[in-house]
C-alpha cells in the first residue's frame, strides 16, 4: 500500500454550494496509485462518525464536493490505494461555507462525449480514533 497520504490537499469553494478538492500523489518512492478515496463531512456529521465518500481513479486528482450548506464547516481527508491496499489518510483540511448569494440552478448542458469514470457516494463510518 502507499506509504504516505496524498499531499497538497486543497479545498476551494467555487460555487455557492460546491467546492473543488484537489491533491497530489503521495511523496516517496514511485507508487502507482490505482484509486483515491475522498472523505468529507460537516462538523456535525464528523462528530457522528459519518462521512460521505467519493472514489476517483488514480489518474484523477480533483473532485467536486456538492450540495454544501452555507453556515457549515466541512472536513476533508484523502487516501491513496494501490493493488496492495489503502494507504494512510491525509491530515484533515477544513472549509467554511459562508452564506452568499442564493445558489442558481446549474444543470450541466447535455454532452454526449463525457468520459466514463464511475463515482460512488455513500457514508463512511469511522471510529473516533480515525477521525484525528
Amino acid at each position: 500500500a502507499p506509504a504516505g497520504p496524498p499531499v497538497g490537499v486543497k479545498v476551494t469553494l467555487i460555487e455557492d454550494d460546491t467546492a473543488l478538492v484537489s491533491w497530489k500523489p503521495p511523496d516517496g518512492p514511485e507508487t502507482v496509485v490505482t484509486r483515491y478515496t475522498i472523505l468529507y463531512a460537516s462538523r456535525k456529521a464528523w462528530i457522528a462518525g459519518e462521512w460521505q465518500v467519493l472514489h476517483r481513479e488514480g489518474a484523477i486528482t480533483m473532485a467536486l464536493l456538492e450540495n454544501l450548506v452555507a453556515g457549515n464547516v466541512y472536513i476533508v481527508k484523502i487516501s491513496a490505494s494501490n493493488e496492495v491496499g489503502e494507504g494512510p489518510f491525509s491530515n484533515s483540511v477544513e472549509l467554511a461555507v459562508l452564506p452568499k448569494e442564493t445558489s442558481e440552478s446549474n444543470q450541466r448542458p447535455k454532452r454526449l462525449d463525457s468520459a466514463d469514470a464511475k463515482v460512488y457516494s455513500g457514508y463512511y463510518h469511522l471510529d473516533q480514533k480515525s477521525m484525528t
Epitope: D16, E66, R111, A117, K118
Partner: nanobody, 122 residues
Framework: EVQLVESGGGLVQPGGSLRLSCKGS????????MHWVRQAPGKGLEWVSA????????YYADSVKGRFTISRDNSKNTLYLQMNSLRAEDTATYYC???????????????WGQGTLVTVSS
C-alpha cells in the same frame, strides 16, 4: 450543439494585461455558472475563477485574486476574464467551462474547444 469558443490569448510581458473571451452557444447561457480553468505546460488542470448565471456571485483562486476579474454579458452569451499584473506562472492554456456533475465525469470540468494560450514572457 453545445459549444464554447475561447479567444484573446497571446504573448504578453510580465506586468501586462490581457482580456480573454468565451462565446457560448447551444444552451441557455444565462442559466449556468461559468468557470475559467487553466493548464500550464506539463501540469494538471487548475481552477481559476467562477461566476454565477446572473453575474452576482464570483469566486477566485488565491493565486489570481486581486489581479483577475471575471465577468459576463448574457446578452452576448459571452464570458470574460480580465487579467492584469500578469506573471510568468500565469502562462497556460485557458478554458471556459461548466461543472460536470453526476456519475459519468472524468474531470470536474468539461472544457470545450481548444482553449486560448496565454504566454507571459519578457
Amino acid at each position: 450543439e453545445v459549444q464554447l469558443v475561447e479567444s484573446g490569448g497571446g504573448l504578453v510581458q510580465p506586468g501586462g494585461s490581457l482580456r480573454l473571451s468565451c462565446k457560448g452557444s447551444g444552451f441557455t447561457f444565462s442559466n449556468y455558472w461559468m468557470h475559467w480553468v487553466r493548464q500550464a505546460p506539463g501540469k494538471g488542470l487548475e481552477w481559476v475563477s467562477a461566476i454565477s448565471g446572473s453575474g452576482g456571485s464570483t469566486y477566485y483562486a488565491d493565486s489570481v485574486k486581486g489581479r483577475f476579474t471575471i465577468s459576463r454579458d448574457n446578452s452576448k452569451n459571452t464570458l470574460y476574464l480580465q487579467m492584469n499584473s500578469l506573471r510568468a506562472e500565469d502562462t497556460a492554456t485557458y478554458y471556459c467551462a461548466t461543472l460536470c456533475r453526476g456519475d459519468s465525469c472524468y474531470s470536474p470540468f468539461d472544457p470545450w474547444g481548444q482553449g486560448t494560450l496565454v504566454t507571459v514572457s519578457s
